[in-house]
């Protein structure tokens, strides 16, 4: 069967028909609809939105749309006992308290159920003590404090600015340093772009705005009480003491008005260098404690949030494939938001909705994709990627045998400057080819391709004339599919100019001010960037589901493997004495990469030449392509991170958002000079080189001729 037997539309026309059906005005309408009230995970409002999406996807023409529910651990503030931070005097009197809520934006003053700013999964507690300012609370910040400045955080409350790394890593680092509480705040240096007004007059963060977010260190586990298995009706749940990834010290977020009040009194050591100074009019002294006149004052945290097992709902829509219904291409993004979700996630959910509508329109005209497309509206992403992970755990046997690709669809925009893509190397050529066929929405690039504007604005650091494509890290719903199951994955969105805007993320991220109006007034009034992202995401799904030969190029994996091997070798060679002493050799890894390169090249030649009309041979070649990503999975996982199983990529151990290449070797080498037993440490480096070399060689062999 050819992929066109189920339709009277030619393949080229299919893609054109699909893309032409996508409309900016619809995305705008859907975004408005999804952002009028909060849709916090575990709430009735978010359940109602799940049912609405289920109903609309059915109307759009999908074959089936089901709700998949799970009972997972979530976290909420206590409605009658609010969280806050105080400065207390020597008598214990509270002489300053942080705000209990964000001032609501215009037009939303009467909206109920706006969850106040909190750090999800913080334990309860009322610690009091001296403050230590720890910059971004990165690994290197604590090294600077402890090793260079000899400042001890043990028994202190630390205050850290948001940005640079995932907030859960900040909390983990503070715990390891012995802190008894963490205050997170948004510094204007990171969340207030110069020359732009605060919301509602611009897209900057006002002083009362606060970033919510979870502070877990799940390392891919999903629901903290049911790691590895779905949180279904008959689940066995761990006790809270054995739960995965929960923080052990109280944590709370504040805005920069409140942060000013805490930081202006700081004494102790001066900041070590200018990289520790933000933009507030405070000295950015590290502490510990307050300066002279205020030295008897302390900081006290009041945290009363509770962890509760709560029902969540994914929406799973199916468009059955005409030729290979047992091959799944998945488009998924989350639905739950911290408050209104103007950008995160509803700018993504609105795009998914329009993509479903377009596919549904084609299906109603008699068309079907070659392969099955699954659409997902995930719940509880903000609480640790819970909905996607539980569903993947429940369906892991199907996914590992049938999963072709996963395309993520969270926020469509984090700026309006250029495209940003993170994906498996297998998808590089797909992304390049697709963006060459799409029109750029950028001013000054009228009549030019998206590829051209993207390449001009975000050039590859290695290859001239090509755009930058980044490694997948984590912090979003592709994690379980890529890092645990080894399903080829990708994500695309419009982003800011990273060179001129050094703030972290976008200023209003996870605040009450992330509204429909923020997008419609300031980011994308014409919704042209949303439309472009819909075309990229939808186009990728279309090609993955419909092309006769899967649009994966294994030669691009060979190129990056060589680059990553070069990089990790260079890191290791910074310890030449130990390399020599312990006979640490990268020969096996370079040899495996060489073999992979040669075998991938031969496979690509066979892919050009084979008889595509022979369905058995076609399926065989496609299976080799589909299973290549799977071949990089080590069933034993990474050390102490069993759900991160991809040997080539993992979220950085120091920043969940960032991807690290050859993570096993990288982590074994990290700070190796401080290890108490160098022989054991370098033995682990050698073991990790062995695991990586074996995995690359084994993956190469999956591309060899089968007999």
């Amino acid at each position: 069967k050819s992929s066109n037997e189920a339709t009277n539309i030619t393949p080229k026309h299919n893609m054109k028909a699909f893309l032409d059906e996508l409309k900016a005005e619809n995305i705008k309408k859907f975004l408005y609809n999804f952002t009028q009230i909060p849709h916090l995970a575990g709430t009735e409002q978010n359940f109602q939105l799940a049912k609405q999406i289920q109903s609309q996807w059915k109307e759009f023409g999908l074959d089936s749309v089901e709700l998949a529910h799970y009972d997972v651990l979530l976290s909420y503030p206590n409605k009658t006992h609010p969280n806050y931070i105080s400065i207390i005097n020597e008598d214990g009197n509270e002489i300053f308290n942080t705000s209990l809520f964000e001032p609501p934006p215009p037009g939303y003053e009467n909206v109920s159920d706006i969850v106040p700013p909190f750090s999800a999964f913080s334990p309860q507690g009322m610690p009091e003590g001296d403050l230590v300012y720890v910059n971004y609370a990165r690994t290197e910040d604590f090294f600077k404090l402890e090793r260079d400045m000899k400042i001890n955080c043990s028994g202190k409350i630390v205050i850290a600015r948001y940005g640079k790394v995932f907030r859960g890593n900040k909390v983990k680092n503070a715990q390891l340093a012995g802190a008894k509480g963490v205050i997170l705040y948004s510094d204007p240096a990171d969340y207030f772009a110069p020359g732009v007004k605060s919301y509602p007059d611009g897209w900057n963060l006002p002083g009362g705005g606060v970033q919510r977010g979870n502070i877990l260190n799940l390392n891919g586990a999903g629901d903290p009480l049911t790691p590895g298995y779905p949180a279904n009706e008959y689940a066995y749940r761990r006790g809270i003491a054995e739960a995965v990834g929960l923080p052990s010290i109280p944590v709370h977020p504040i805005g920069y008005y409140d942060a000013q009040k805490l930081l202006e009194k700081m004494g102790g050591s001066a900041p070590p260098d200018s990289s520790w100074r933000g933009s507030l009019k405070v000295p950015y002294n590290v502490g510990p404690g307050f300066t002279g006149n205020f030295s008897t004052q302390k900081v006290k945290m009041h945290i009363h949030s509770t962890n509760e097992v709560t029902r969540i709902y994914n929406v799973i829509g199916t468009l059955r494939g005409a030729v290979e219904p047992d091959r799944y291409v998945i488009l998924g993004g989350h639905r739950d938001s911290w408050v209104f979700g103007g950008i995160d996630p509803q700018s993504g959910a609105a795009v998914v909705h329009e993509i479903v509508r377009s596919f549904g329109t084609l299906k109603k005209e008699g068309w079907r994709p070659r392969r099955t497309i699954l659409f997902a509206s995930w719940d509880a992403e903000e609480f640790g990627l819970l909905g996607s992970t539980e569903w993947a755990e429940e369906n892991s046997r199907l996914l590992q045998e049938r999963g072709v690709a996963y395309i993520n669809a969270d926020s469509s925009i984090e700026g309006n400057y250029t495209l940003r893509v993170d994906c498996t190397p297998l998808m590089y050529s797909l992304v390049h080819n697709l963006t060459k066929e799409l029109k750029s929405p950028d001013e000054g690039f009228e009549g030019k391709s998206l590829y051209e504007s993207w390449t001009k604005k975000s050039p590859s650091p290695e290859f001239s004339g090509m755009p930058r494509i980044s490694k997948l890290g984590s912090g979003n719903d592709f994690e379980v599919f890529f890092q645990r199951l080894g399903i080829a994955s990708g994500r695309a969105r419009y982003t800011k100019n990273w060179e001129t805007n050094k703030f972290s993320g976008y200023p209003l991220y996870h605040s009450v001010y992330e509204t429909y109006e923020l997008v419609e007034k300031f980011y994308d009034p014409m919704f042209k960037y949303h439309l472009t992202v819909a075309q990229v995401r939808g186009g990728m799904v279309f090609e993955l589901a419909n092309s006769i030969v899967l649009p994966f190029d294994c030669r691009d994996y060979a190129v990056v493997l060589r680059k990553y091997a070069d990089k990790i070798y260079s890191i290791s060679m910074k310890h030449p004495q130990e390399m020599k002493t312990y006979s640490v050799s990268f020969d096996s890894l370079f040899s495996a990469v060489k073999n992979f390169t040669e075998i991938a090249s031969k496979f690509s030649e066979r892919l050009q030449d084979f008889d595509k009309s022979n369905p058995i041979v076609l399926r065989m070649m496609n299976d080799q392509l589909m299973f290549l990503e799977r071949a990089f999975i080590d069933p034993l996982g990474l050390p102490d991170r069993p759900f991160y199983r991809h040997v080539i990529y993992a979220p950085s151990s120091h920043n969940k958002y960032a991807g690290e290449s050859f993570p096993g070797i990288y982590d074994a080498l990290f700070d190796i000079e401080s290890k108490v037993d160098p022989s054991k440490a370098w033995g682990e480096v050698k073991r990790q080189i062995y695991v990586a070399a074996f995995t690359v060689q084994a993956a190469a062999e999956t591309l060899s001729e089968v007999a």
Partner: nanobody, 113 residues
Framework: EVQLLESGGGLVQPGGSLRLSCAAS????????LSWVRQAPGKGLEWVSS????????DYADTVKGRFTISRDNSKNTLYLQMNSLRVEDTAVYYC??????WGQGTLVTVSS
């Protein structure tokens, strides 16, 4: 059998330049990243620079950044280290290294007035 043969060392005045070469044989040269490592008299080994498969992928120790340039010619199976603005503290035996375990015999660079 892997062989790495360094050359180009010698005596040079501070501020002067030298170009070291490392001729390689016995392995698929272009398939390996390579490094320069040095050992100053009475000191331990110190990494200087590494290079990947092409001249884009390079890395340098802070002590030599901006003064030294590593490069390779895959057609000639040769690794190079161009050393400019040499300092007294650059005096050392310079080794070419493949994969971490295969080392050349080294070439002596002496920077002295």
């Amino acid at each position: 059998e892997v062989q790495l043969l360094e050359s180009g060392g010698g005596l040079v005045q501070p501020g002067g330049s030298l170009r070291l070469s490392c001729a390689a044989s016995g392995f698929s040269f272009s398939s390996y990243a390579l490094s320069w490592v040095r050992q100053a008299p009475g000191k331990g080994l110190e990494w200087v620079s590494s290079i990947g498969e092409n001249n884009h992928t390079t890395d340098y120790a802070d002590t030599v950044k901006g003064r030294f340039t590593i490069s390779r010619d895959n057609s000639k199976n040769t690794l190079y280290l161009q050393m400019n603005s040499l300092r007294v503290e650059d005096t050392a035996v310079y080794y070419c290294v493949k994969d971490g375990v295969h080392w050349g015999q080294g070439t002596l660079v002496t920077v002295s007035s």
